[in-house]
């Protein structure tokens, strides 16, 4: 393993459509991939009138957008379906939405709002 990199070997698995898809609804998914490829976990969810509905959670594979992310954070502003990915075993147990704001006139004391966490 490369120093400082969190190896992902398993992720929290969830499938909202488990009855329709006839799979387990929740569990632990082992992540497989080529030895030279990185493995990640992901979470995807919807915000229906302020209520969080998880769609899927599980393994995600070698995606530069997920590199070195220890926390699962969605940064896109108001997507239809929220998505985040991260590195480290079961790192998708918790996920958050923290949109990157357009940089306007900086204040002398910028405040970083704490992202809401879901699990």
């Amino acid at each position: 393993a490369i120093l400082g990199r969190s190896e992902t070997q398993e992720c929290l698995f969830f499938n909202a459509n488990w009855e329709k898809d006839r799979t387990n609804q929740t569990g632990v998914e082992p992540c497989y991939g080529d030895k030279d490829k990185r493995r990640h976990c992901f979470a995807t969810w919807k915000n229906i009138s302020g209520s969080i509905e998880i769609v899927k959670q599980g393994c995600w594979l070698d995606d530069i957008n997920c590199y070195d992310r220890t926390d699962c954070v969605e940064k896109k502003d108001s997507p239809e379906v929220y998505f985040c990915c991260c590195e480290g075993n079961m790192c998708n147990e918790k996920f958050s939405y923290f949109p990157e704001m357009e940089v306007t006139q900086p204040t002398s004391n910028p405040v970083t709002p704490k992202p809401p966490y879901y699990n």
């Epitope: 329709k20 387990n24 998914e29 992540c31 497989y32 995600w60 995606d63 957008n65 239809e80």
Partner: antibody, heavy 120, light 107 residues
């Protein structure tokens, strides 16, 4: 070497059944998602269903519900797809495929395909 | 059922060209979009999964982008071995559905 090796070509009569086998090697068969996809001559691709052997229960496309049965034998790392009440439109190449993840991220390892011809 | 459409259905190009194939989903599929290449008499080959990451062993001249309902596959500096049929597939919700394919031919 990661591979899926399928059984040979079949010629069947309308109304009969066919069972295609798919032997896996080089990966963790029991905890992998194995799907079946078919392709009629000169046509596109059609997903039929799939299963994760440790879960045991297959997930089928509505179109094939009641006519297709997907099973797996963990002891021999072999998946099976049985299609019943065959009709001429079922003439196609049938592929077994390994998915990258349980959430169907992509079909990365394909069998060589099994040609099933339905003809009277 | 989510319906996938591809455009164009066929196109002619020359070695060295850059081509773009578009795939649209009838409803949002987030990032659950894969691209496959198929040559006559062969099984399809996974090129791209999750809308943009490249599958193992796929040359970097292939790239994918998009999310939701609109996706593209771009092949830059076409090589002779790239002339084939390309399919997109959504795996966001069952039944997982494929586009009708785009046949890439040599001009």
């Amino acid at each position: 070497q990661v591979q899926l090796v399928q059984s040979g070509a079949e010629v069947k009569k309308p109304g009969s059944s066919v069972k295609v086998s798919c032997k896996a090697s080089g990966f963790q068969f029991r905890t992998s998602l194995i799907s079946w996809v078919r392709q009629a001559p000169g046509q596109g691709l059609e997903w039929m269903g799939g299963l994760i052997p440790i879960f045991g229960t297959a997930n089928y496309a509505q179109k094939f519900q009641g006519r297709v049965t997907i099973t797996a034998d963990e002891s021999t790392s072999t998946a099976y797809m049985e299609l019943s009440s065959l009709r001429s439109e079922d003439t196609a190449v049938y592929y077994c495929v390994k998915d990258l993840t349980w959430t169907n991220l992509g079909l990365d390892i394909w069998g060589q395909g099994t040609m099933v011809t339905v003809s009277s | 059922e989510i319906v996938m459409t591809q455009s164009p259905s066929s196109l002619s190009a020359s070695v060295g060209d850059t081509v773009t194939i578009t795939c649209r989903a009838s409803q949002g599929v987030s990032r659950w979009l894969a691209w496959y290449q198929q040559k006559p008499g062969k099984a399809p080959r996974l090129l791209i999964y999750g809308a943009s990451p490249l599958s193992s062993g796929v040359p970097s001249r292939f790239s994918g982008s998009g999310s939701g309902t609109h996706f593209t596959l771009t092949i830059s500096s076409l090589q002779p071995e790239d002339f084939a049929t390309y399919f997109c597939q959504q795996s966001y919700s069952t039944p997982f559905t494929f586009g009708p394919g785009t046949k890439l031919e040599i001009k």
